[in-house]
């Protein structure tokens, strides 16, 4: 069966939107009005992995682009990147672990934990216009809580 996907945008708990920053990076900033069109639309695919009531494994692709968020070691540090894939083979139900995030719902907020690196989360900073990254703490000054807005296909 084909993998189930939905289109959505994400905003952090400070209401910062996610936009492209160069060809292989995302950044977070406050957008208003027409600028909202800049925000990236994700194709969130529901993939194979450990699942529970509040934890669902997903892959986060960029809609109509052959780019997926992935988690890899760079200089011995878990790092978030946008990785180019062959569109003929993706998305798929059994995604490589680096592409998988555990979508965790807590109090109507979402966290995205790396399946490859447990306790590392998609994060933004308090500062404006700075990259989205993989952070190793929750509840500190880095932001790990997001809301999801559905986008019609």
């Amino acid at each position: 069966a084909p993998v189930r996907s939905l289109n959505c945008t994400l905003r952090d708990s400070q209401q910062k939107s996610l936009v492209m920053s160069g060809p292989y990076e995302l950044k977070a900033l406050h957008l208003q009005g027409q600028d909202m069109e800049q925000q990236v639309v994700f194709s969130m695919s529901f993939v194979q992995g450990e699942e529970s009531n509040d934890k669902i494994p997903v892959a986060l692709g960029l809609k109509e682009k052959n780019l997926y968020l992935s988690c890899v070691l760079k200089d011995d540090k878990p790092t978030l990147q946008l990785e180019s894939v062959d569109p003929k083979n993706y998305p798929k139900k059994k995604m490589e672990k680096r592409f998988v995030f555990n979508k965790i719902e807590i109090n109507n907020k979402l966290e995205f934990e790396s399946a490859q690196f447990p306790n590392w989360y998609i994060s933004t900073s308090q500062a404006e216009n700075m990259p989205v990254f993989l952070g190793g703490t929750k509840g500190g000054q880095d932001i790990t809580d997001f809301t999801m807005q559905f986008v019609s296909s």
Partner: antibody, heavy 118, light 107 residues
């Protein structure tokens, strides 16, 4: 008053290492992104590296990637730049700078000179 | 990487002149542009951020304009302390990049 004071520069042979420090005061260091920016003698400004307040997010210029490492100790209000495999073209004044709104450098240190020569 | 091109690279002017420096980005950087002033032997000083916002404490004779790829720094009525080198810097994406600088000399 915001103050940034770099130290650790000096003369080093090609292939050698240096560790620069930047002592910060007059603001809540742990809340700010920080940059290293360099300026070769008689040349323009070149951005080198950035680190987030928590230290989890770092980025580097291609010219130093794999050789330089930025880090910070928020308990000591200090920013660091570990420089390995130094080359003649790394000769420059190295400035640390506090990152202001949206990615500008709103306060700068006085700089420390690194000379790579045999 | 985004290339930043400044013009002119140097200019001679007199006290009281109105001076315009141009900075062009190789791609759209929205309004994520800063301007700095540097005098010999000193660290750069932030003048303008977000293309048009005057940094606190900077005299109002300095102003910035533009968005997208084309930006200008204007100095109305040059003062003796304004003879320096000016740099633009894009903050749209990493790696951050600076223009090559514009040296303003006394005529």
């Amino acid at each position: 008053e915001v103050q940034l004071l770099e130290s650790g520069g000096g003369l080093v042979q090609p292939g050698g290492s240096l560790r620069l420090s930047c002592a910060a005061s007059g603001f809540t260091f742990s809340k700010y992104f920080m940059f290293w920016v360099r300026q070769a003698p008689g040349k323009g400004l070149e951005w080198v590296s950035v680190i987030s307040p928590s230290g989890y997010m770092t980025r580097y210029a291609d010219s130093v990637k794999g050789r330089f490492t930025i880090s910070r100790d928020n308990s000591k209000n200090t920013l660091y730049l570990q420089m390995n495999s130094l080359r003649a073209e790394d000769t420059a004044v190295y400035y640390c700078a506090r990152v202001g709104y949206g990615g500008n450098s709103d306060y700068w240190g006085q700089g420390t000179l690194v000379t790579v020569s045999s | 990487d985004i290339q930043m091109t400044q013009s002119p690279s140097s200019v001679s002017a007199s006290v009281g002149d109105r001076l315009t420096i141009i900075c062009r980005a190789s791609q759209d950087i929205n309004r994520w542009l800063a301007w700095y002033q540097q005098t010999p032997g000193n660290a750069p000083k932030l003048l303008i951020h977000s293309a048009t916002s005057l940094q606190s404490g900077v005299p109002s004779r300095f102003s910035g304009s533009g968005s997208g790829t084309d930006f200008t720094l204007t100095i109305n009525s040059l003062q003796p302390e304004d003879f320096a080198t000016y740099y633009c810097q894009q903050a749209d994406s990493f790696p951050l990049t600076f223009g090559g600088g514009t040296k303003v000399e006394i005529k």
